[in-house]
């Protein structure tokens, strides 16, 4: 129920990447506005992006601050030019969004070799450890500093001649592999937090080939 | 309840080909690796090869290199070997199993096997 | 490849005894070893993994431990449904490779 002229939102979805976390939502308005509010299970409701003509709501503020909470958002519609007007009810439509955990959800985003030096028949291969909007002290922290050791990473590595691609893991954000003398290895990385159920894996970060700008060959 | 159900083994001869399938059910295949390992009768556990179903990158021992391929949809959450070239020595039980992922964790799940029998 | 030499390939014991297997990788592994339980006709089942960590459900008296790139599994009083073949694996790098395992059989 509710005035003639709003209609609830619906399909209310969280989309987040490396806790960069924004609420989207249908229809796009006609004769209509939104307000989103935000809380945590035991928290108060917090509003953000007032009266806006926009289907999505960049609510990373308040997800960072606590990423390990629970978060519940909903979706406010208000007839457009006549905010105070609401539902039969007494109260303006809203709709709930699902639950969302940031720590548990957030989309790995797509990592980056920093870069590989080989000495000899060994490669070091070093992740970029990316920042996030996650804050402490004043400072962003970076992926590895929010995830700790639940974050790992997997390298795919292959001769530049083949297709088969070997596998190696590690929980910092470097690898130490070995390789054979006089052959051109590429490789991709993938972020993994094992420990989730589902959204487990990062797409694959670039592929970099040694003969490569970012690589360092050192003859030993 | 995650599981893991191999399919498709059987008798063929020597040069011959075979399709297994390993369904998944309880989890999805694209957040984990999948596996094939095999074992000859009487004989201890063989590596064959592992899929990653997120970006269809794969890797073989060498003794099916260039005639096994692993493949996966997703769609329908299943693995599947294709064994073409088939030799004698190519009999065994075939487990497909789940790669959990992580640096400390490997094969945690494994399906019952299915038998191929490569003989003339 | 990295080469898993597992010893022995079977043993004798009797119900309570202490049972020790090991597997030798032949570089590093660092902790990346995990050990196997397969009964005839039957999967194996994961016991061990990263050397030292008892797998969800496995009973306290099997252990792991690693000394350099010396592994072993411990069963410290065997019980009836021990009896099974046991197996290492590495899983560090690319081919994942197994011991040969070890047949554990009754007195």
């Known amino acids: 129920s509710g005035t003639t002229n709003t209609v609830a939102a619906y399909n209310l979805t969280w989309k987040s990447t490396n806790f960069k976390t924004i609420l989207e939502w249908e229809p796009k308005p006609v004769n209509q506005v939104y307000t989103v509010q935000i809380s945590t299970k035991s928290g108060d409701w917090k509003s953000k992006c007032f009266y806006t003509t926009d289907t999505e709501c960049d609510l990373t503020d308040e997800i960072v601050k606590d990423v390990k909470q629970t978060y519940l958002a909903r979706v406010f519609s208000y007839p457009a030019g006549n905010v105070e007007s609401t539902g039969s009810a007494g109260e303006p439509l809203y709709e709930n969004s699902p639950e969302f955990t940031p720590y548990l959800e957030t989309n790995l985003g797509q990592p980056t070799i920093q870069s590989f030096e080989q000495v000899g028949t060994k490669v070091n291969v070093t992740v970029e450890d990316e920042r996030t909007l996650v804050r402490r002290n004043n400072t962003f922290l970076s992926l590895r500093d929010v995830f700790g050791k639940d974050l790992i990473y997997t390298l795919y590595y292959w001769k530049s001649s083949s297709s088969g691609k070997k596998t190696a893991k590690t929980n910092t954000n470097e690898f130490l592999i070995d390789v054979d003398k006089g052959e051109n290895y590429c490789f991709s990385v993938q972020a993994v937090i094992p420990s989730r159920t589902v959204n487990r894996k990062s797409t694959d970060s670039p592929v970099e080939c040694m003969g490569q700008e970012k690589g360092e060959f050192r003859e030993i | 309840e995650v599981q893991l159900v191999e399919s498709g083994g059987g008798l063929v001869q020597p040069g011959g080909s075979l399709r297994l399938s390993c369904a998944a059910s309880?989890?999805?295949?694209?957040?984990?690796?999948i596996h094939w390992v095999r074992q000859a009768p009487g004989k201890g556990l063989e590596w064959v090869g592992y899929i990653d179903p997120y970006n269809g990158y794969t890797y073989y021992a060498d003794s099916v290199n260039g005639r096994f391929t692993i493949s996966a949809d997703t769609s329908k959450n299943t693995a599947y070997l294709q064994m073409n070239s088939l030799r004698a020595e190519d009999t065994a039980v075939y487990y497909c199993?789940?790669?959990?992922?992580?640096?400390?964790?490997?094969?945690?799940?494994w399906g019952q096997g299915t038998l191929v029998t490569v003989s003339s | 490849d990295i080469q898993m030499t597992q010893s022995p390939s079977s043993l004798s014991a009797s119900v309570g005894d202490r049972v020790t297997i090991t597997c030798r990788a032949s570089q590093d592994v660092n902790t990346a070893v995990a050990w196997y339980q397969q009964k005839p006709g039957k999967a194996p089942k994961l016991l061990i993994y990263?050397?030292?960590f008892l797998y969800s459900g496995v009973p306290s008296r099997f252990s792991g431990s690693r000394s350099g790139t010396d592994f072993t599994l411990t069963i410290s009083s065997l019980q009836p449904e021990d009896f099974a073949t046991y197996y290492c694996?590495?899983?560090?790098?690319?081919?994942?490779?197994f011991g040969q395992g070890t047949k554990v059989e009754i007195k």
């Open positions: 990263s050397a030292s």
């Open positions: 199993a789940r790669d959990y992922g992580s640096y400390l964790v490997s094969l945690d799940y």
């Open positions: 309880g989890f999805t295949i694209s957040d984990y690796w």
């Open positions: 694996q590495q899983h560090y790098t690319t081919p994942p490779t």
